[in-house]
């Protein structure tokens, strides 16, 4: 055989998003000679790993290798063999692993160690597995959507590449909802960011950006539900919890030990006179909304303005892309259209939550009951978080765009993460020849 042929004029990258509820593998592709241009990287594949998030493997780390196999094999099929050894692989773990690390650093390290050993067995350029911070998760999500929307390009276009793209260079804010955390990231208008922890400075393509970001740990949709249940069971008179966030006729038994397993419910933990309780749905949007609001402490704010729990939030500015679970939930509820007002969304949620469980099961026969049962809560939670948590109003609601993909690439933190780690976002506007890596963020 001969020496390696010159690399193809395309490159690939792989990012695994190890979320709290599941892991997804993304494959990105770009022309090698244009890697400093904005908007050239696109997603060619998403592979959802079968099973839960990696934090659930804490007692069965030996199964992690098998768990990752199918999607890693898919990557070997999609990426040409001649490119495998040059293709970087990154794994970023988010809030599920942040929570595990809070419980036990040793257990979190053990899971990551096995993940690293499993991924290094593949013929790719494995670059490591790590728990990314909430600030990174917010920042990379913001970078992703603005990169895909062409907001970093200095060339102003007379045409629009996506339906909600305005022609100006104003960046979109990013709203990300996961299972265990939620992030809000945007460029405030001439507002000092009063809390240094929430301030990011970027220089991208020759322009400076002062970005606000915050990640609310325990306020992803799954952990918020555990919080709500832990809060509500405190005042239940017996082992029956009549819950307005589930459809009338819905019943489910919950183990108290499961409820208190997560650090997110510690503040509500108490000794209960039973090991199990039964959720009985009553399907009432208004009551559900009220119950959710009790998770947001709005009585304390050491800044000029707060979101909740004493966290600084500047006045909202511009358009926002709401993705991940914001999109998946609203898409299921058929509420992603730009034309649907906030009042209409609320009205439709009221109707949806009031529908009997048996009727819901019949209408959505193909959907797993575990997920189906939680859409009333999740939809109500999204409204509560956006309106009361982040202070969107009926008027500013129209500035929220529920986004699944942009130009065929998923909205989320993974693309931004890869762009940064592969030095593909130059600090300065590229000239005809790429700048040295020293200028990169």
């Amino acid at each position: 055989t001969q020496n390696k042929a010159l690399p193809e004029n395309v490159k690939y990258g792989i990012v695994l998003d190890a979320g709290s509820s599941h892991t997804s593998l993304y494959i990105y592709k770009w022309p090698a000679e244009k890697e400093n241009d904005t908007g050239v990287v696109h997603q060619v594949e998403e592979c959802r790993v079968k099973g839960p998030g990696i934090s659930k493997f804490v007692q069965k780390v030996n199964e992690i290798g098998i768990y990752l196999t199918d999607c890693m094999e898919r990557a070997r099929e999609v990426i040409p063999r001649s490119q495998h050894q040059e293709t970087p692989v990154y794994l970023g773990a988010t809030a599920g692993m942040r929570l595990l690390r809070m419980e036990s650093e040793e257990l979190a390290d053990r899971v990551l160690d096995v993940v690293e050993r499993s991924l290094s067995n593949y013929p790719f350029d494995f670059q490591g597995a790590r728990i990314i911070t909430g600030q990174e998760e917010g920042a990379y999500g913001w970078i992703t959507i603005n990169y895909l929307l062409g907001k970093f390009s200095q060339k102003t276009r007379w045409f629009s590449i996506v339906p909600y793209e305005t022609n100006n260079q104003e960046t979109f804010g990013a709203l990300d909802l996961g299972g265990a955390s939620t992030q809000v990231t945007f460029v405030p208008q001439n507002q000092t960011i009063e809390s240094p922890d929430n301030a990011l400075q970027f220089r991208l393509y020759g322009k400076d950006y002062n970005v606000y970001t915050h990640s609310f740990l325990c306020y992803g949709k799954d952990q918020a539900l555990w919080q709500k249940l832990a809060k509500d069971i405190q005042v239940a008179s017996n082992e029956i919890l009549r819950d307005p966030c589930f459809h009338p006729g819905y019943k489910k038994v919950v183990n108290v030990s499961d409820l208190y397993k997560t650090p997110c419910t510690k503040r509500f933990e108490m000794t209960l006179p039973f090991q199990q309780f039964e959720i009985q749905g009553i399907g009432n949007y208004q009551q559900c909304h009220q119950s959710i609001l009790e998770l947001f402490n709005t009585s304390y704010c050491p800044y000029s303005q707060c979101a909740f729990n004493g966290i600084f939030l500047p006045p909202l500015q511009g358009d926002f892309g709401a993705f991940s679970a914001f999109y998946f939930v609203m898409k299921f509820l058929n509420l992603t259209s730009e034309k649907v007002s906030q009042e209409k969304v609320t009205e439709m949620m009221k109707k949806f939550c009031a529908q009997p469980w048996e009727e819901i099961k019949t209408s959505y026969a193909g959907v797993k009951e575990k997920y189906l049962s939680e859409y009333c809560f999740s939809g109500t939670y999204i409204l509560s978080l956006l309106l009361q948590g982040y202070h969107f109003t009926a008027d500013s609601w129209e500035h929220i765009h529920f986004i699944g993909k942009i130009q065929g690439s998923d909205a989320g933190w993974t693309l931004g993460y890869m762009l940064n780690l592969t030095n593909m976002i130059p600090a300065e506007q590229p000239l005809s020849t790429p700048l040295s890596h020293s200028t990169y963020v």
Epitope: Q2, N3, R81, S82, H84, Q85, S120, D125, F126
Partner: antibody, heavy 121, light 107 residues
Framework: EVQLVESGGGLVKPGGSLRLSCAAS????????MNWVRQSPGKGLEWVGE??????????HYAESVKGRFTISRDDSKNTLYLQMNSLKTEDTAVYYC????????????WGQGTTVTVSS | EIVLTQSPATLSLSPGERATLSCRAS??????LHWYQQKPGQSPRLLIY???QSISGIPARFSGSGSGTDFTLTISSLEPEDFAVYFC?????????FGGGTKLEIK
């Protein structure tokens, strides 16, 4: 001409140590994953392990039979691959080949001539 | 680990005849299967890679086929220099493994 030349073999007692070297020439050594493969007398071939590149943090992988006893390393500035063998057993007696793949991966299109290691009391 | 089973262990044929060597994998390895020839006192030599890819400098009489778990090395018309030991190798996943070999001898 692409060439791999092993050295360092010899007779060693069980429990002893030995370090094999492999000098590479005729190709850009630092760009290729390198492997050791061995062949016991009159037997088949057995992969010993591999070492990847600096960009892969010189990641190594080993066969179960040598894990914890053998260590593969490389010195890109000297175009040399090493195999440090500790706690040697009689079953480690074999001809040890240094190998690489100049095309793609996980097959071996370049082999050294081999160096013989005999573990015996 | 992936176990490769070669058959037959020994194959006795005459020059000019067609040789068919088999290699079976314990699980599917797609086309990540490679073939080597080894003569006494020599290092192995790569003949075929990725099940069927031929190599420059290797005579055209050597060909490979198969995918998944069953693979075949065919020598269309044996030459005297082809009598040697042939090994197959798993190039799909670590640990890399070899078959036990097929000895091709002159009848």
């Amino acid at each position: 001409e692409v060439q791999l030349v092993e050295s360092g073999g010899g007779l060693v007692k069980p429990g002893g140590s030995l370090r094999l070297s492999c000098a590479a020439s005729g190709f850009t050594f630092s760009k290729y994953w390198m492997n050791w493969v061995r062949q016991s007398p009159g037997k088949g071939l057995e992969w010993v392990g591999e070492i990847r590149l600096k960009s892969n943090k010189y990641g190594t992988h080993y066969a179960e039979s040598v894990k914890g006893r053998f260590t593969i390393s490389r010195d890109d500035s000297k175009n040399t691959l090493y195999l440090q063998m500790n706690s040697l057993k009689t079953e480690d007696t074999a001809v040890y080949y240094c190998t690489t793949q100049l095309d793609l991966y996980w097959f071996f299109d370049v082999w050294g001539q081999g160096t013989t290691v005999t573990v015996s009391s | 680990e992936i176990v490769l089973t070669q058959s037959p262990a020994t194959l006795s044929l005459s020059p000019g005849e067609r040789a068919t060597l088999s290699c079976r994998a314990s699980q599917s390895i797609s086309d990540y299967l490679h073939w080597y020839q080894q003569k006494p006192g020599q290092s192995p030599r790569l003949l075929i890679y990725y099940a069927s890819q031929s190599i420059s400098g290797i005579p055209a009489r050597f060909s490979g086929s198969g995918s998944g778990t069953d693979f075949t090395l065919t020598i269309s018309s044996l030459e005297p220099e082809d009598f040697a030991v042939y090994f197959c190798q798993n190039g799909h996943s670590l640990p890399l493994t070899f078959g036990g070999g097929t000895k091709l001898e002159i009848k």
